[in-house]
């Protein structure tokens, strides 16, 4: 007699064969906070931007990607202390002379009002109230994200 | 009448409430190759190491972490062309003067026989036959990994 979970594995596997859908997260892992269709993890330790990116990656997640001003505000509402900074997945691309998300897309200039310089070795952090350009070597906290809902036919081409 | 998949969501969610287990991958997403308890994605495009790390992260995966010589050999067996290099999740930490995996652990010197220098801005690539130290700015292919099996009580403390 199979448990319901074992039966689920079979059901989902058969479903995936038809739809090429990967299971996705059904709800957020322990310690992660749900914000709409994402799970967010706010670090308690500090790291430069690069190490923060690596940490999210080893957690099979991404440094936070913010779609629009609305998502920024909702994320900032989860930050308790006004002075604390958190890395997100946005840094300055010297070759393209533009702010670039780690998924390869460029910042829509209307989305975030960045305080500070757009220059080499600059990465973006958010606080409870603002968005700042900081040296990427600065050691601050960071936010990882996981997509919560499974997406049908979600595939992973190269960026 | 709920579909079997909808019922599964409920079953798995109830199960997770008891076990703090996150669903995990039941099998590999399309385009990913299974190697034991991992899913691997071999890129077809090229990138410097940092961009490769970012790409894996946005795919909610990690640059390849290799546990031991055995896993290295099995991974290399999946590489078809002798001349092609792939970034993995290992680079040189200048402050600690040592090879460091992106999960924060240091390389066990017996695990990989690295050809090339251990110095600033050096990152590790693998080919079908060898392990090389390359400038991190070198644009080559890369390998992302996802853990395949759900791990009970898997939590994500800061690195």
């Amino acid at each position: 007699q199979k448990s319901s979970i074992e039966k689920c594995s079979v059901d989902i596997q058969q479903s995936r064969n038809k739809t090429t859908e990967r299971p996705g997260l059904l709800n957020c892992p322990i310690y992660w906070q749900q914000l709409r269709e994402k799970c967010l993890l706010f670090s308690h330790t500090v790291n430069p931007w690069n190490n923060s990116l690596a940490d999210c990656s080893t957690k099979e997640s991404s440094l936070l990607l913010i779609r629009d001003k609305d998502e920024l505000i909702h994320t900032q509402n989860l930050i308790r202390d006004k002075a604390i900074l958190f890395w997100i997945g946005l840094n300055f691309s010297l070759s393209e002379k533009n702010w670039k998300w780690i998924n390869g897309s460029f910042l829509n200039s209307n989305d975030l009002e960045i305080r500070g310089d757009a220059k080499e070795n600059s990465c973006i952090s958010i606080s409870q109230t603002s968005v700042y350009s900081e040296y990427c070597s600065t050691e601050i906290r960071w936010i990882c994200q996981k997509e919560l809902t499974p997406v049908r036919n979600k595939v992973y081409p190269d960026s | 009448q709920k579909s079997s998949i909808e019922k599964c969501s409920v079953d798995i969610q109830q199960s997770r409430n008891k076990t703090t287990e996150r669903p995990g991958l039941l099998n590999c997403p399309i385009y990913w190759q299974q190697l034991r308890e991992k899913c691997l994605l071999f890129s077809h495009t090229v990138n410097p190491w940092n961009n490769s790390l970012a790409d894996c992260s946005t795919k909610e995966s990690s640059l390849l972490l290799i546990r031991d010589k055995d896993e290295l050999i099995h991974t290399q067996n999946l590489i078809r062309d002798k001349a092609i290099l792939f970034w993995i999740g290992l680079n040189f930490s200048l402050s600690e003067k040592n090879w460091k995996w992106i999960n924060g652990s240091f390389l066990n010197s017996n695990d990989l026989e690295i050809r090339g220098d251990a110095k600033e801005n050096s990152c590790i690539s693998i080919s079908q036959t060898s392990v090389y130290s390359e400038y991190c700015s070198t644009e080559i292919r890369w390998i992302c990994q996802k853990e395949l099996t759900p791990v009970r009580n898997k939590v994500y403390p800061d690195s």
């Epitope: 430069p48 002075a83 700042y132 600065t138 050691e139 | -």
Partner: antibody, heavy 122, light 108 residues
Framework: QVQLVESGGGLVKPGGSLRLSCAAS????????MSWIRQAPGKGLEWVSY????????AYADSVKGRFTISRDNAKNSLYLQMNSLRAEDTAVYYC???????????????WGRGTLVTVSS | DIQLTQSPSSVSASVGDRVTITCRAS??????LAWYQQKPGKAPKLLIY???SLQSGVPSRFSGSGSGTDFTLTISSLQPEDFATYYC??????????FGGGTKVEIK
């Protein structure tokens, strides 16, 4: 309890050297930016140097650049200031200070030691 | 370098008085400003950070305001233990992290 204790101050001749130490306890030292700040007798406060949590990033005030070296040993919960080529104008109480966590290089000093007096005189 | 000018340099006040100290930056520093209290022979103590956030354990009679170049520290009702020297400090991400010249609050 949470505290910082400086040591190593004293009387030194111009051109001489001193090494200040700061012992931290009661908090996770390796997660904080640490600084040295000084105060000349009867004067205001002057930031001297900072070091990032990992020790990878360091900065100095122009007045001490090339003469002072900041360092840390996270395993020993200790901060250091090596002072060379000392001048009369370096005479001051030297404070070790911790910055609020996770504000990066925006250094708000939320914990201070009691200070150690350095006197440079012939 | 960013200069901070505090005024007044000293103020005489009585217990229960409302005291206001201002700090002006030579260029805009957003909200990257702190206020400290220092008593003779003691280390400074952080009162306010991020221009208006009250540091843990600091009495609510202390408050900070301002943004850009002009900032204010207010003590709503002066207590005997508040007689001290007060310093502002700018903490933009670029060193040096300059302090104001100080304001001495004395007993009238």
């Amino acid at each position: 309890q949470v505290q910082l204790v400086e040591s190593g101050g004293g009387l030194v001749k111009p051109g001489g050297s001193l090494r200040l130490s700061c012992a931290a306890s009661g908090f996770t030292f390796s997660q904080y930016y640490m600084s040295w700040i000084r105060q000349a007798p009867g004067k205001g406060l002057e930031w001297v140097s900072y070091i990032s949590p990992s020790g990878a990033t360091i900065a100095y005030a122009d007045s001490v650049k090339g003469r002072f070296t900041i360092s840390r040993d996270n395993a020993k919960n200790s901060l250091y200031l090596q002072m060379n080529s000392l001048r009369a104008e370096d005479t001051a109480v030297y404070y070790c200070a911790r910055s609020l966590m996770a504000t990066g290089t925006h250094l708000y000093f939320d914990l201070w030691g009691r200070g150690t007096l350095v006197t440079v005189s012939s | 370098d960013i200069q901070l000018t505090q005024s007044p340099s000293s103020v005489s006040a009585s217990v229960g008085d409302r005291v206001t100290i201002t700090c002006r930056a030579s260029q805009g520093i957003s909200s990257w400003l702190a206020w400290y209290q220092q008593k003779p022979g003691k280390a400074p103590k952080l009162l306010i950070y991020a221009a208006e956030s009250l540091q843990s354990g600091v009495p609510s009679r202390f408050s900070g305001s301002g943004s850009g170049t002009d900032f204010t520290l207010t003590i709503s009702s002066l207590q005997p233990e508040d007689f001290a020297t007060y310093y502002c400090q700018q903490v933009t991400s670029q060193p040096p992290y300059t302090f104001g010249g100080g304001t001495k609050v004395e007993i009238k």
